[in-house]
Interface confidence: low
């Protein structure tokens, strides 16, 4: 089955502005920082700060930039050829299970547990059993038992049942 | 609002074939990128395969002989022909689509369908 181009599936006012720059696609390519004309013919030139290609492409419009979520800062700016790099703020992390969102770093380890490894902007702090040196499954332990690394109480159960 | 809906998922015996279906519906403007990925117990998602809108297809490298992405834009769909399947294609299969709703000036990356459950299993 065939790739089939109809009109609806172009965009009509994706044509270049005036301050968009025009070249030639090679081999039906267009180069990084740039997309494809409707027709094809003109590589038209990704808009700084608002979108982006990473490769040789034939898009029909370049990738929006990511804009950075409160709770995440920017590391560097989106530009035609890279979008913008977020990293969670300090204390918090993104976990591979759900990457939309930053998470609150654990304060401390469960009872009989040391930490081996701190918070970062990608992993939570590691936590391993003293005897025999396993890592914790990550599962938050009820707050009576956690051991916190910082100063400060830890705060009060949701009453638990079970 | 934008729906992908996937269809074609099932259990197959080893050197089985399936085929996948995903429609995409709703508010679109037009459609980049169209592709396929999969998340096994445990691991992260993959892309499976993608597909350009002119046609031109990037296939991950275990899948390049097996695995067949193609699309129809004028029904806004992509399909992925998968054939000598092996148990460690189990996985739930997602559609995704980089997709500019009417009225929008970008498209976003970030739609995907529900999924649908490929075993492969004797």
């Known amino acids: 089955e065939s790739a089939l181009i109809t009109q609806q599936d172009l965009a009509p006012q994706q044509r270049a502005a005036p301050q968009q720059k025009r070249s030639s696609p090679s081999e039906g390519l267009c180069p990084p920082g740039h997309h494809i004309s409707e027709d094809g013919r003109d590589c038209i030139s990704c808009k700084y700060g608002q979108d982006y290609s990473t490769h040789w492409n034939d898009l029909l419009f370049c990738l929006r930039c990511t804009r950075c979520d409160s709770g995440e800062v920017e590391l560097s700016p989106c530009t035609t050829t890279r979008n913008t790099v977020c990293q969670c703020e300090e204390g918090t992390f993104r976990e591979e299970d759900s990457p939309e969102m930053c998470r609150k770093c654990r304060t401390g380890c469960p009872r009989g547990m040391v930490k081996v490894g701190d918070c970062t902007p990608w992993s939570d702090i590691e936590c391993v059993h003293k005897e025999s040196g396993t890592k914790h499954s990550g599962e938050v332990p009820a707050v009576e038992e956690t051991v916190t690394s910082s100063p400060g109480t830890p705060a009060s159960p949701c009453s638990l049942s079970g | 609002e934008v729906q992908l809906v996937e269809s074609g998922g099932g259990l197959v015996q080893p050197g089985g074939s399936l085929r996948l279906s995903c429609a995409a519906s709703?508010?679109?403007?037009?459609?980049?990128?169209m592709g396929w990925y999969r998340q096994a117990p445990g691991k992260q998602r993959e892309l499976v395969a993608e597909?350009?809108?002119?046609?031109?297809?990037n296939y991950a490298d275990s899948e390049k002989s097996r695995f067949t992405i193609s699309r129809d834009n004028a029904k806004r769909t992509v399909n992925l022909q998968m054939n000598s399947l092996k148990p460690e294609d189990t996985a739930v299969y997602y559609c995704?689509?980089?997709?500019?709703?009417?009225?929008?000036?970008?498209?976003?990356?970030?739609?995907w369908g529900q999924g649908t459950q490929v075993t492969v299993s004797s």
């Open positions: 995704n689509a980089e997709v500019r709703e009417r009225g929008t000036s970008w498209y976003r990356p970030d739609y």
């Open positions: 709703g508010s679109i403007d037009s459609i980049n990128n």
């Open positions: 597909i350009t809108p002119r046609g031109r297809t």
